[in-house]
Interface confidence: low
């Protein structure tokens, strides 16, 4: 018995269906096929869980959190013992193993390993201003999404004809900050932050209005 080499890893957007591949070749009839799918969750590597089991011509549910969401992609018994996971959750991220036995066929590699990563588009980011908006001050524009896997990058742009930040601005796309030094009237306007990762984008807007000092009355 020989389990085929897996593609290594599968990525899927949260809520969508993941298909975890596992197939094997055997010299024996599929009369005594046993298949166990296990997961080592990324969130708790010390606690492997059973995902689904095929034994004695019957399917058995694994851990409670997989009930009603998991099944074999094809009719069992078969040499393709791939499974699907519906409505994927962040907690489904982990290393999945298929363990195959088909007596009397012994020897060879009977385990296949596939990583599953559940991706999450950036949640609506929060846009904030830090610092005084008085003329000549330094301000920091902050942008942050609570959710997003892979970790989002943040791009700030000024919503005018150029879409360019003021010349005194420096941007950190990883942290989501823009520092604008010595703000002037030209710094005023609407700014947009775009949080993006491989599967989606989300935006927030911020209105920066530079406050000019009032002329002192004599």
């Amino acid at each position: 018995l020989e389990v085929s080499e897996s593609p290594g890893s599968v990525q899927v957007a949260r809520g969508q269906t993941a298909v975890l591949p596992c197939a094997f070749s055997t010299s024996a009839a599929l009369l005594n096929l046993n298949v166990i799918w296990m997961v080592i969750p990324l969130s708790n590597a010390n606690q492997p869980e059973q995902v689904i089991l095929y034994q004695g011509g019957q399917m058995f549910d694994g851990a409670l959190r997989f009930h009603g969401r998991v099944g074999f992609t094809g009719t069992m018994p078969a040499t393709n013992v791939s499974i699907f996971i519906n409505n994927t959750q962040l907690s489904d991220t982990g290393t999945y193993q298929c363990l195959v036995n088909n007596l009397p066929d012994r020897g060879g590699r009977n385990i296949g390993v596939t990583g599953l990563t559940v991706l999450v588009p950036p949640s609506a980011p929060q846009c904030q201003i830090q610092g005084s908006q008085d003329l000549g001050s330094d301000v920091i524009l902050l942008c942050s999404s609570e959710e997003g896997i892979p970790r989002p990058t943040y791009l700030w742009e000024k919503l005018d004809n150029t879409l360019k930040l003021p010349p005194t601005a420096t941007q950190d796309q990883v942290q989501g900050t823009v520092t604008i030094r010595n703000i002037s009237a030209l710094s005023s306007g609407l700014y947009q932050c775009v949080a993006s990762n491989a599967i989606g984008t989300s935006t927030c807007l911020l209105d920066l209005q530079v406050i000019s000092p009032q002329p002192r009355s004599v």
Epitope: P7, V10, Q11, V12, A13, G15, Q16, T17, A18, V19, P21, T73, F84, T153, L155, E157, L163, Q173, Q192, V194, S196, N197, A198, I199, G200, T201, T203
Partner: antibody, heavy 123, light 111 residues
Framework: QLQLQESGPGLVKPSETLSLTCTVS??????????WGWIRQPPGKGLEWIGS???????YYNPSLKSRVTISVDTSKNQFSLKLSSVTAADTAVYYC???????????????WGQGTMVTVSS | QAVLTQPPSVSGAPGERVTLSCTGT?????????VHWYQQFPGTAPRLLIF???NRPSGVPDRFSGSKSGTSASLAITGLQVEDEADYYC???????????FGGGTKLTVL
């Protein structure tokens, strides 16, 4: 309206790097929510997605080509580019650039295409 | 080898109704991802014909319609016209490959 135009050499030698640029006109490449992709079509064959990029620089590629592909974006020029290294005759194809929105299960079709540019790999 | 399977050729007479099929797997069409259809004339770029399995972009006649069931999708063309003669491609997202996949294309001939 938005238009895309591919440009680059029509002939590349085997083992060299294929380089193409797509220029976006009639709209901004920085439009929120839109991704920009490359698709190719060998003579007489079907379409193959190569990879896509967001204007912030986020990229993702066809796993079968990933080791040879680099896609980059230049927002100041409203352009995005494709580099495919170590080319062989099998990379001979019409290369298209196209726009698509990435929202899983929602409008992730390639809705605007360039006219395509033929690239031949030959010594 | 294309990930989505389409018949290489389909033909029909003017005025007839033809159906073009696109068969996928549980990791693409069957994973509840939308199927999109493109029309391509010789020497030109593909044009989006149907998106989201059954939606038409503006300018596409209502003679074209899409549907999806299980791991298969279909493009139906009613009142076939000579100018419909072209190649048709289906496309979907594939969770196993983490990318967009196309069918091999169907050449539609109007007799």
């Amino acid at each position: 309206q938005l238009q895309l135009q591919e440009s680059g050499p029509g002939l590349v030698k085997p083992s060299e790097t294929l380089s193409l640029t797509c220029t976006v006109s009639g709209g901004s490449i920085s439009s929120s929510g839109y991704y920009w992709g490359w698709i190719r079509q060998p003579p007489g064959k079907g379409l193959e997605w190569i990879g896509s990029i967001y204007y912030s620089g986020s990229t993702y590629y066809n796993p079968s080509l990933k080791s040879r592909v680099t896609i980059s974006v230049d927002t100041s020029k409203n352009q995005f580019s494709l580099k495919l290294s170590s080319v062989t005759a099998a990379d001979t194809a019409v290369y298209y650039c196209a726009r698509h929105r990435v929202r899983f299960g929602e409008f992730d079709a390639f809705d605007i295409w360039g006219q395509g540019t033929m690239v031949t790999v030959s010594s | 080898q294309a990930v989505l399977t389409q018949p290489p050729s389909v033909s029909g007479a003017p005025g007839e109704r033809v159906t073009l099929s696109c068969t996928g797997t549980s990791s693409n069409v069957g994973a509840d991802f939308d199927v999109h259809w493109y029309q391509q004339f010789p020497g030109t770029a593909p044009r989006l014909l149907i998106f989201g399995s059954d939606n038409r972009p503006s300018g596409v006649p209502d003679r074209f319609s899409g549907s999806k069931s299980g791991t298969s999708a279909s493009l139906a063309i009613t009142g076939l016209q000579v100018e419909d003669e072209a190649d048709y491609y289906c496309q979907a997202y594939d969770v196993r490959l983490s990318g967009w996949v196309f069918g091999g294309g169907t050449k539609l001939t109007v007799l």
